[in-house]
């Protein structure tokens, strides 16, 4: 069952689909000046059995000029909204990601592929929320969203990421300031920061997932 | 079943300063930042700011700044504002409320603020 | 900070009716809107958040819509107990401010 709805926007954040779940779609686009060959797929499908999941269908380019130069590559890893479009970025992969039973990895790129990719989510998709550089977590609460099915709809939960760019300022004298975190800058000038504990660098996410694949700001 | 509940009413005198505290039940309480509001007499809501249950780091509104303290005992799974050097312009109903959506608020604790 | 201006202040209308009460900020905020209720004496109830998405329980004759700057929250068919006062918020950037409210009266 597709989700109906995008993964909610969180202010300041990005999201990212650590796998893709069976049923998931991506759809072929081409970068300007090409486009999909005749007969080429519409779009990859995540698909497989118990032990083993793969995407189906190869997206191909061809120049919009001319009709004989097909190249085809598999497509490349990427923050995606569904039906909706975000900027590639550079091909990161955790390693835990293919052991999960009945997800597909991030498909590698296609030649000429366009610069923001579509994917369709399905039921049961999680993605994970990570502040884009610049803010820092206020709070980390569960930095993931999920697509649900209740009462016959789909919906997303909300996560509960809280990004800001405030300065940080101690909330008593004479405490000792917490470290702040590298991108951490003033933002408004009409809400103030204070910090009360030290602050927990690491955002804590499900599924060791690894900070560094958050490497492209998306919004 | 979620239930934000806070602290009862409070009379104080200008200059003194109130306490408001909020119980969170029914939930994982570090995982909801909880905002404070108030809402004066026949007025609208205003935010007053937010702080992680987690960490403790808090955000005010510029208007508040070096009156408000906002504080969590997570032991107890409760919020505090703590709103000092009140004026009778502090006089309204402040509520907690939960998480980025503010999906469940406090019943409200009414401050009086008078000499 | 982000104004938020609500329109109209006030109305009134009958049972049945479809009412519409439109949310204005003062710079883009996305889809980092929410809506809430509030009858006389209660504490704020979620109706609608990021825009469009109906909080658990709130009844589907409610619908909200809108994206950057301008807002609306629907009712398609007014019932007696819709009464009270209707506040649009912002989640952008701190501080997250209201909307001044739009008093909804029952014919």
């Known amino acids: 069952e597709l989700c109906d709805d995008d993964p909610p926007e969180i202010p300041h954040a990005t999201f990212k689909a650590m796998a893709y779940k069976e049923g998931t779609m991506l759809n072929c686009e081409c970068k300007r000046g090409f486009r999909r060959i005749k007969s080429g797929s519409l779009y990859m499908l995540c698909t497989g059995n118990s032990s083993h999941s793969s995407w189906d269908n190869q997206c191909q380019c061809t120049s919009s000029a001319t009709r004989n130069t097909t190249k085809q590559v598999t497509p490349q890893p990427e923050e995606q909204k569904e039906r909706k479009t975000t900027e590639m970025q550079s091909p990161m992969q955790p390693v835990d990601q293919a052991s999960l039973p009945g997800h597909c990895r991030e498909p590698p790129p296609w030649e000429n592929e366009a610069t923001e990719r579509i994917y369709h989510f399905v039921v049961g998709q999680m993605v994970y929320y990570q502040c884009v550089q610049g803010y820092r977590a206020l709070h980390r609460g569960p930095a993931e969203s999920v697509c649900k099915m209740t009462h016959g709809k789909t919906r997303w939960t909300q996560p509960q990421l809280i990004c800001t760019g405030e300065m940080e300022t101690s909330q008593f004298p004479g405490e000792e300031k917490p470290q702040a975190s590298p991108e951490g800058r003033p933002e408004s000038e009409t809400s103030c920061l204070v910090t009360t504990t030290d602050f927990q660098i690491q955002t804590e996410m499900a599924a060791t997932m690894e900070t560094s694949i958050f490497t492209t700001e998306y919004q | 079943q979620v239930q934000l509940v806070q602290s009862g009413a409070e009379v104080k005198k200008p200059g003194a300063s109130v306490k408001v505290s909020c119980k969170g039940s029914?939930?994982?309480?570090?995982?909801?930042?909880m905002h404070w509001v108030r809402q004066a007499p026949g007025q609208g809501l205003e935010w007053m700011g937010v702080?992680?249950?987690?960490?403790?780091?808090?955000i005010y509104a510029q208007k508040f700044q070096g009156r408000v303290t906002m504080t969590v005992d997570k032991s107890t799974s409760t919020a505090y504002m703590e709103l000092s050097s009140l004026r009778s312009e502090d006089t309204a109903v402040y509520y907690c409320?939960?998480?980025?959506?503010?999906?469940?608020w406090g019943q409200g604790t009414t401050v009086t603020v008078s000499s | 900070d982000i104004q938020m201006t609500q329109s109209p202040s006030s109305l009134s209308a009958s049972v049945g009716d479809r009412v519409t009460i439109t949310c204005r900020a003062s710079?883009?905020?996305?889809?980092?809107l929410e809506w809430y209720q509030q009858k006389p004496g209660k504490a704020p109830k979620l109706l609608v958040y990021?825009?469009?998405t109906l909080a658990e329980g709130v009844p589907s004759r409610f619908s909200g819509s809108g994206s950057g700057t301008d807002f609306t929250l629907t009712i398609s068919s007014l019932q007696p107990e819709d009464f009270g006062t209707y506040y649009c918020?912002?989640?952008?950037?701190?501080?997250?401010?209201f909307g001044q409210g739009t008093k909804l009266e029952i014919k």
């Open positions: 409320a939960r998480g980025v959506t503010f999906d469940y």
């Open positions: 029914g939930y994982t309480f570090t995982d909801y930042a």
């Open positions: 702080i992680s249950t987690y960490s403790g780091d808090a």
């Open positions: 710079q883009d905020i996305s889809n980092y």
């Open positions: 990021n825009a469009k």
């Open positions: 918020q912002h989640h952008y950037d701190t501080p997250y401010t």
